[in-house]
Amino acid sequence: HNTTVFQGVEGQSLQVSCPYDSMKHWGRRKAWCRQLGEKGPCQRVVSTHNLWLLSFLRRRNGSTAITDDTLGGTLTITLRNLQPHDAGFYQCQSLHGSEADTLRKVLVEVLADPLDHRDAGDLWVPGESESFEDAHVEHSISRSLLEGEIPFPPTS
């Protein structure tokens, strides 16, 4: 697995997407976990609804929310109010029994708000870094979903 970098700015929201083969992972719950070291387990942060058919419903643990579009094959994780300690190495996982398949390895990068509030004339937003070749960067700063909002309503 290559690592995908998602950059966000402190205090804002970051949306991480993990595409997958919807047929291959049919019926499987998904999870978002954090790798705290080079070795050791990936610590579960949040997982989708216990009932797979309700995976479109948003589940939340603190400032982290997860929802799964099982038909389109996209797992979406939203980190609200990004803080420096949210930065780290994460994985999107597909669960089956006690096993977990890695859907995507994700590096979340939290940058300090570059807008110096003492001099508001120098607005800067994250741009693609030129210093690395082996990582795909996505800048995905977005609002968090509202309470009760269903991001992927079931189709009739």
């Epitope: 790798q35 080079e38 420096p84 300690h85 930065a87 780290g88 190495f89 940058l111 870094s129 960067v137």
Partner: antibody
Framework: EVQLQQSGPVLVKPGASVRMSCKPS????????MNWVKQSHGKSLEWIGS????????SYNQNFRGKATLTVDKSSSTAYMELNSLTSEDSAVYYC?????????????WGQGTLVTVSA | DVQLTQSPSFLTASPGETITINCRAS??????LAWYQEKPGKTNKLLIS???TLQSGIPSRFSGSGSGTDFTLTISSLEPEDFAMYYC?????????FGSGTKLEIK
């Protein structure tokens, strides 16, 4: 064993610039954030900023924006900090300090410091 | 910026005693606080992270507690090598900030 080797002391004139280096060993350079910290004589510690060597993404203390520039050279696994338009206020010891795995949950390893003296 | 008020600034104690150093944040920083030891001629040492997590290789006489705004570093049964400068640091939000330091001197 993890070590952070910093470049030696420098004496510079006001208005000049200086670039110091931090060469880590004992771990994978790109896996850990690198931070820079200032300590003026007899004073506390002041965080300047941090850089993610994997992406080159950096964050700065607003007090040092325009003063400090953080860079990395992945080919030599070395972190650099450049300070410009130096004044006597910039005379201090500057430390590099390694963060945690792709994050900054405390600075587990520190360099020995680089003493910068600004004097005419 | 989050201000960290460290107290006391100076502390004298004897080997074998137990001491506490306090660190108060100007706003809640949850558990995101670290404690460091600074000694002349040595590189700074991370003692505690996440408010209470002892780093590997650090003696168990060091302990940290607290969350939110009030934190404490406790050193029980002081050893001669413990007399040094101690700093707290928050990494809850940018810019990371340090306390003003506590100098622990031998009585």
């Amino acid at each position: 064993e993890v070590q952070l080797q910093q470049s030696g002391p420098v004496l510079v004139k006001p208005g000049a610039s200086v670039r110091m280096s931090c060469k880590p060993s004992g771990y994978t350079f790109t896996d850990y954030y690198m931070n820079w910290v200032k300590q003026s004589h007899g004073k506390s510690l002041e965080w300047i900023g941090s850089i993610n060597p994997y992406t080159g993404g950096s964050s700065y203390n607003q007090n040092f924006r325009g003063k400090a520039t953080l860079t990395v050279d992945k080919s030599s696994s070395t972190a650099y900090m450049e300070l410009n338009s130096l004044t006597s206020e910039d005379s201090a010891v500057y430390y590099c300090a390694r963060g945690s795995y792709y994050s900054n949950l405390g600075f587990a390893y520190w360099g020995q410091g680089t003493l910068v003296t600004v004097s005419a | 910026d989050v201000q960290l008020t460290q107290s006391p600034s100076f502390l004298t104690a004897s080997p074998g005693e137990t001491i506490t150093i306090n660190c108060r944040a100007s706003k809640s920083i949850s558990k995101y606080l670290a404690w460091y030891q600074e000694k002349p001629g040595k590189t700074n040492k991370l003692l505690i992270s996440s408010g209470s997590t002892l780093q590997s290789g650090i003696p168990s006489r060091f302990s940290g507690s607290g969350s939110g705004t009030d934190f404490t570093l406790t050193i029980s049964s002081l050893e001669p090598e413990d007399f040094a400068m101690y700093y707290c640091q928050q990494y809850s939000e940018y810019p990371f900030t340090f306390g003003s330091g506590t100098k622990l001197e031998i009585k």
